[in-house]
Amino acid sequence: LPAQVAFTPYAPEPGSTCRLREYYDQTAQMCCSKCSPGQHAKVFCTKTSDTVCDSCEDSTYTQLWNWVPECLSCGSRCSSDQVETQACTREQNRICTCRPGWYCALSKQEGCRLCAPLRKCRPGFGVARPGTETSDVVCKPCAPGTFSNTTSSTDICRPHQICNVVAIPGNASMDAVCTSTSPTRSMAPGAVHLPQPVSTRSQHTQPTPEPSTAPSTSFLLPMGPSPPAEGSTGD
């Protein structure tokens, strides 16, 4: 004969554990049902009655099967330098990530607590290491024979064009100027850009349309300009 299926609450066999999505209640000394994600335990089980679950209250969530008496509070609204990549629902916390041009200066378990603007390298300096989701841009002086004439968080130093006859020699912040209209060899005229860091979580880089409440929360304010490092600007 097949073993009889026990319905919660039930006393487990000595030495055995409760089944999946059940927990052992110490007070009742019974295996009882857990509550599903998006719910919490409103009334704990007894020897004769199972757990009573209730939906999470507004702005709270539970992500796992649980028997917590209260759901967890969602994090604060995302600040203006952030994008909400996951909304607060009954089953998941809000996740805020930094918008393009910013990086996460202070991360939390999921998403970012504090975003800061990516450093911009000033003319004469180029990007040595591009910014990522969690690290700032590193600038370096343009080596002899290269230049950058932009203030940018993505442009690297580019080689000077090579002239038959040089009218004005190039320097770290300016390309060489040739007397003839056609230099013997020229690099591609467009600035060289490094790719912006893209949030791996985000399905989109633009904030999703919101109700009239614009996200701008008290402890999630953008940091001021990043501290000036050599060759960087806080603009």
Partner: antibody, heavy 120, light 108 residues
């Protein structure tokens, strides 16, 4: 754009009941709550209750538990407030307002209000 | 129930004045759950500040909010003619959710 449009003014006799509607447009009704707030003439705002249109779950101020019935019809994106056993002191403007789930109850859009006058 | 008490109940001020309205809760309210509304005569209330200190888009930066626990403040840094209205605080921390009695800001 987001709009909450309420039904027109009502004049009722004591003991009667009234049903006020609030039609929503410009947003998804799924992850919002619809609240009802009343304001007696020259008085402040009083929260009466709220409904989750997706589930029909309601929550009331106990003061209005037996007085007000909240309902909604998602097929026409409309929330309703029915007030029974009307008395002169129920004369007020009744507002519907929405709060998105996850916004900690901030009511970001309001209806224009419905004046209910109870007089014999 | 959590009682919300605003002070003053009314005040007279001139254009350009700095105005401060306080809201005291009878028990502690999480800052995320404290909001302020502005209401003009014959109009529906309008969300002015959410979660203690945050301005919805379109609300001028002369409005600001602060506070924690039981004491919260709404400040208008430089009163403008269109700011003459009644202001309400609102807690959503514990049901039933309650409003302050309102503070009427009038022209001096």
């Amino acid at each position: 754009q987001v709009q909450l449009v309420q039904s027109g003014s009502e004049l009722k006799k004591p003991g009667a009941s009234v049903k006020v509607s609030c039609k929503a447009s410009g947003f998804n009704n799924k992850d919002i709550y619809m609240h009802w707030v009343r304001q007696a003439p020259g008085q402040g705002l009083e929260w009466m209750g709220r409904i989750d249109p997706a589930t029909g779950n309601t929550k009331h101020d106990p003061k209005f538990q037996d007085k007000a019935v909240l309902s909604s019809d998602t097929s026409v994106s409309t929330a309703y407030l029915q007030i029974s056993s009307l008395k002169a002191e129920d004369t007020a403007v009744y507002y519907c307002a929405r709060s998105p789930y996850g916004d900690f109850g901030a009511m970001d859009y309001w209806g224009q209000g419905t004046l209910v006058t109870v007089s014999s | 129930d959590i009682q919300m008490t605003q002070s003053p109940s009314s005040l007279s001020a001139s254009v350009g004045d700095r105005v401060t309205i306080t809201c005291t809760a009878s028990s502690s309210v999480s800052s995320n759950y404290l909001h302020w509304y502005q209401q003009k005569p014959g109009k529906a209330p309008k969300l002015l500040i959410y979660s203690t200190s945050n301005l919805p888009s379109g609300v001028p930066s002369r409005f600001s909010g602060s506070g924690s626990g039981t004491d919260f403040t709404l400040t208008i840094s430089s009163l403008q003619p269109e700011d003459f209205a009644t202001y309400y605080c609102h807690q959503y921390h514990r049901s039933p959710w309650t409003f302050g009695q309102g503070t009427k800001v009038e022209i001096k």
